[in-house]
């Protein structure tokens, strides 16, 4: 007998063909021999089955000797063996209806787990294979679990259910609620304006919640809340902002903050958290601020950086157009009795300049 797999909520068409291409008597029955539909004269008639309001036939193909049964809005309990009686012969078709759903909301925070549950008819033994948008393959039986969702898991998951060498494909849209970046670092010279941006990795029609930026300055013993804000339907309103520094925040997404000037006392790390309405847990993004200062005091030319820098970063003092250079994998470099001219202080990572500050040394007579 023929096996057909269907998807819960979908429509399936079971086919039955007569040997002659002409309109003739036919009946579709279920395994209990209850008539579902058939032909009487030129008209479609329906029997007393539970399917009667969801069953139909493609009448346009009757005169081609094709007597299909279409079942709409499939249910798991529609799984059965259906019998087509035509020209004194019987054709059996086994219909197996499967459903695949996410156990929880399909909008999940990064780090949360996703469980997909397969609904299947009794007696079936299907296997499920799911592929994430990022190409991750997961296999399972009645349930499939993804323990810790990552940003790249956002998008359409394609799941294939296999039974009796037949397959049916499900597509489930999963939205991982996260910031686009887990961490970002801003490099600034002292006195420059600082802009922090926190773009989200998803879009929602209605986005409501509240957030806060906590800041741990390198020079401070404890962290401090710099700003708290509300988000209502994608509109940002500031609730409380510290007096020092006096941050400004944009009223539109993406979340955007400006610091009037980069100062050594602000250098450090921040953690922006966003709690979304009706969601447990918070979205996080780390942001770092590195500040550079180049100064000349008496016979000493110094370049310093504050903030979270990796040990592999190099700090250099270099006289423009000359070979004179002093470099260190440290947070401060200095030159005693520097030559007159334009000196450059450079913070670099494997040759790539991250931050540069120029200071003019005037000759001392």
């Amino acid at each position: 007998k023929k096996v057909v797999l269907g998807k819960k909520g979908d429509t399936v068409e079971l086919t039955c063909n007569a040997s002659q291409k002409k309109n003739t008597q036919f009946h579709w029955k279920n395994s209990n021999q209850i008539k579902i539909l058939g032909i009487q004269g030129l008209f479609l008639t329906k029997g007393p089955s539970k399917l009667s309001d969801r069953a139909d036939s493609r009448k346009s193909l009757w005169d081609q000797g094709c007597f299909s049964m279409i079942i709409k809005n499939l249910k798991i309990e529609d799984s059965d063996t259906y019998i087509c009686e035509v020209e004194n012969k019987k054709e059996e078709v086994e219909l197996l209806v499967f459903g695949l759903t996410a156990n929880s909301d399909t909008h999940l925070l990064e780090g949360q787990s996703l469980t997909l549950t397969l609904e299947s008819p009794p007696g079936s033994s299907p296997s499920v294979k799911c592929r994430s948008p990022g190409g991750k393959n997961i296999q399972g039986g009645r349930t499939i679990s993804v323990p810790q969702l990552e940003r790249q898991d956002s998008g359409t998951w394609t799941c294939t259910v296999s039974q009796d060498q037949k397959t049916v494909e499900f597509k489930i849209d999963i939205v991982v609620l996260a910031f686009q970046k887990a961490s970002s670092t801003v490099y600034k010279k002292e006195g420059e304006q600082v802009e922090f941006s926190f773009p989200l990795a998803f879009t929602l029609e209605k986005l409501t919640g509240s957030g806060e930026l906590w800041w741990q300055a390198e020079r401070a013993s404890s962290s401090k809340s710099w700003i708290t804000f509300d988000l209502k339907n994608k509109e940002v309103s500031v609730k409380r902002v510290t007096q020092d520094p006096k941050l400004q925040m944009g009223k539109k997404l993406p979340l955007h903050l400006t610091l009037p000037q980069a100062l050594p006392q602000y250098a450090g790390s921040g953690n922006l958290t966003l709690a979304l309405e009706a969601k447990t847990g918070k979205l996080h993004q780390e942001v770092n601020l590195v500040v550079m200062r180049a100064t000349q005091f008496q016979e000493n030319l110094t370049c310093e950086v504050w903030g979270p820098t990796s040990p592999k970063l190099t700090l250099s003092l270099k006289l423009e157009n000359k070979g004179a250079t002093v470099s260190k994998q440290a947070k401060a470099v200095w030159v005693l009795n520097p030559e007159a001219g334009m000196w450059q202080c450079l913070l670099s990572d494997s040759g790539q300049v991250l931050l540069e500050s120029n200071i003019k040394v005037v000759p001392t007579w």
Partner: antibody, heavy 117, light 107 residues
């Protein structure tokens, strides 16, 4: 046609009060933030106040805080500005404006408020 | 509050000229800036929103550019009806702030 029509302007003595109204038509009023902007004679534009769709959030320029109140009646498609303790420097044309979220896009013709003894 | 500095305050030009007006924010405001045109006795009219998007119905000779702190309104070829006062508006956060205005006059 999308339209905003202001009314309620006039001459008032310093310390007096006035209530400006704005009738909106041609768009779904309850879906937009609304704004008042003013312009003193011969001067530039000054944003005065904003109100959210449901009236739950209101913002004011510092110079009018505590004296002016912005409000709305979505059932009547109307925006209001209650102005108390008026000063000579409040003399201006007051415009009712629709805030499209990314711009102040539709402006009324304005109503003149003169504060003078 | 973030300050907006518009320049020049006045400008003389002729029909057919290319004209540029600038607006500078005291702090970064992304692209949250609009440009308006106002003629005497009339309400302002929106020309450009989100720094560079042309408002529907506005002639393509008007264009906007910039982001962060520096913004520009350009009229590629002045027409007689373009002589008016132009204002920039920061709608990055509250309070909204207008520039001081640029009066564009016929030379």
């Amino acid at each position: 046609e999308v339209q905003l029509v202001e009314s309620g302007g006039g001459l008032v003595q310093p310390g007096g009060s006035l209530r400006l109204s704005c009738a909106a038509s041609g768009f779904t009023f309850s879906s937009y933030w609304m704004t008042w902007v003013r312009q003193a004679p011969g001067k530039g534009l000054e944003w005065v106040a904003n109100i959210k769709q449901d009236g739950s959030e209101k913002y004011y320029v510092d110079s009018v805080k505590g004296r002016f109140t912005i409000s709305r009646d979505n059932a009547k498609n109307s925006l209001y500005l209650q102005m108390n303790s008026l000063r000579a420097e409040d003399t201006a044309v007051y415009y009712c404006v629709r805030d499209r979220y990314d711009a102040l896009d539709i402006w009324g013709q304005g109503t003149m408020v003169t504060v003078s003894s | 509050a973030i300050q907006m500095t518009q320049s020049p305050s006045s400008l003389s030009a002729s029909v057919g000229d290319r004209v540029t007006i600038t607006c500078r924010a005291s702090q970064g405001i992304r692209n949250d800036l609009n440009w308006y045109q106002q003629k005497p006795g009339k309400a302002p009219k929106l020309l450009i929103y989100a720094a560079s998007s042309l408002q529907s119905g506005v002639p393509s000779r008007f264009s906007g550019s910039g982001s962060g702190t520096d913004f520009t309104l350009t009229i590629s070829s002045l027409q007689a009806e373009d002589f008016a006062t132009y204002y920039c508006l920061k709608d990055y956060n509250y309070p909204y702030t207008f520039g001081q205005g640029t009066k564009l006059e016929i030379k």
